[in-house]
């Protein structure tokens, strides 16, 4: 039950995280015009990974796409790549994790297969989250660098009294969305990995060894088996975990020469 809850919660958290990563990637407000200690402008500039926008005081907003690939800064390209890789990995992870969910039955899929798929999706979510966090952090670093550079020469003289005011950019909403979303995806991935441990069958399934007392039989089964007490030969022992998710009710074991002491 705890395993199913952990896996389900991990899936939901990752799903929210990946939705957030997609939203952040599409958002235009990665960087926004710094309004503090600046001349009051009648326009508000903000930029995303794909286009830059200007909102005029009348409310009119105009956006222009970056219609060049080669002319864009390498850092921006890197951020784009990181975010897209994060989205792709996250999407594949979601697809895999749907089939890995314990609450969903698909044919006669073994628990071991589900465990492997859960681990795979968990790792994918972790890498996806890290890609998003890395992408957002690279962009944030780029902003900080540019901010202090433009602050250093806030007013660049153009001869005599004529000056041009440099627009400084600060963190936009998309950065915070990206950080949170990346973190959620990462957490979801870790939860999936934890759930995988619970789903995985035990490494060693020892043969059942029965100890018979004179009056009744005591069945002792180590390595993931529950000990149960019964009378006669009709005692049934259930495994806690089994790769094929079957109990001994379903698979009859016949006594061999090693079964009795």
């Amino acid at each position: 039950m705890a395993v199913t809850a952990c896996q389900g919660l991990g899936f939901v958290v990752s799903l929210i995280g990946i939705a957030g990563i997609i939203a952040a990637t599409c958002m235009d407000q990665w960087s926004t015009q710094d309004l503090y200690n600046n001349p009051v402008t009648a326009v508000f500039n903000y930029q995303g990974l794909w286009r830059s926008c200007v909102r005029e005081s009348s409310g009119f907003t105009e956006c222009r796409g970056y219609f060049t690939l080669l002319g864009l800064p390498a850092m921006l390209q890197a951020v784009r790549a990181l975010m897209i890789v994060g989205i792709v990995l996250g999407a594949i992870g979601l697809l895999v994790s749907i089939f890995a969910l314990k609450c969903i039955r698909i044919g006669s899929m073994e628990d071991s297969a589900k465990a492997n798929m859960t681990l795979t999706s968990g790792i994918m979510f972790i890498v996806s989250g890290l890609c998003a966090i890395a992408g957002v952090s690279v962009f944030a670093n780029m902003l900080v660098t540019n901010f202090w550079m433009s602050t250093a020469n806030m007013y660049t003289g153009m001869g005599g009294m004529v000056q041009t005011v440099q627009t400084r950019y600060t963190f936009g909403a998309a950065l915070f969305v990206g950080w949170v979303a990346g973190g959620l995806t990462l957490i979801g991935g870790v939860m999936m990995c934890i759930a995988c441990r619970g789903l995985a069958p035990e490494e060693t399934n020892y043969k059942a060894v029965s100890y018979h007392a004179s009056g009744h039989s005591v069945a002792y089964k180590p390595g993931g088996f529950k000990a149960s007490t019964g009378f006669g030969s009709n005692t049934k022992n259930k495994k806690i975990y089994d790769g094929g998710a079957r109990t001994e009710d379903e698979v009859q074991s016949y006594p061999s020469k090693h079964d009795y002491v």
Epitope: P39, V40, A42, V43, G59
Partner: antibody
Amino acid sequence: EVQLVESGGGLVQPGGSLRLSCAASGFTFSSFGMHWVRQAPGKGLEWVSYISSGSSPIYYVDKLKGRFTISRDNAKNSLYLQMNSLRAEDTAVYYCARAGYAVRNALDYWGQGTLVTVSS
Amino acid sequence: DIVMTQSPDSLAVSLGERATINCKSSQSLLNVGNQKNYLAWYQQKPGQPPKLLIYGASTRESGVPDRFSGSGSGTDFTLTISSLQAEDVAVYFCQNDLFYPLTFGGGTKVEIK
């Protein structure tokens, strides 16, 4: 047809107060920012104040801050300018103007103006 | 505040001739975000309110005759009347539309020679 009609101007003594109104019609008033601009007799244009469609933000020319207050009532399609502690140099024709949409913040429609005379 | 300096103060041009008015701003009116200039030109005839002619330094407002054209970028701008007509006699103002407070030039009076 877009129409802006100013009212409330007149003769006032120095230190007095006056409230100008601007009645708007022919467009969705609540969707547009509005300006007040004044022009002293025989002089150039001087921008006074701006109020956005939702009443925030509001901007004033520095020298009039504290004395002049811009406001609007979208339900009544009206713009107002409350002028306090009036001085002789505030004598001018006061125009209300619409902040045009998609015209790079230019003022695309103007009223005929109302004359404010501050004199003792 | 941005200072808008217009020149000349007055201009006398023969009918059908070209009239050129200059406007210089103390800071660049080019917005880096969209590479657009935030400068407008207005025409004010005697006893009338100003009328918008040009916005964004070079875009004619609808209904404005094509003899009016605007040019320039950054800090230097020009309004040109290619062929002056009698109805063009007026005072012309340039305006900074990028920084608050929005500021106007002192005006240029255009007359017929």
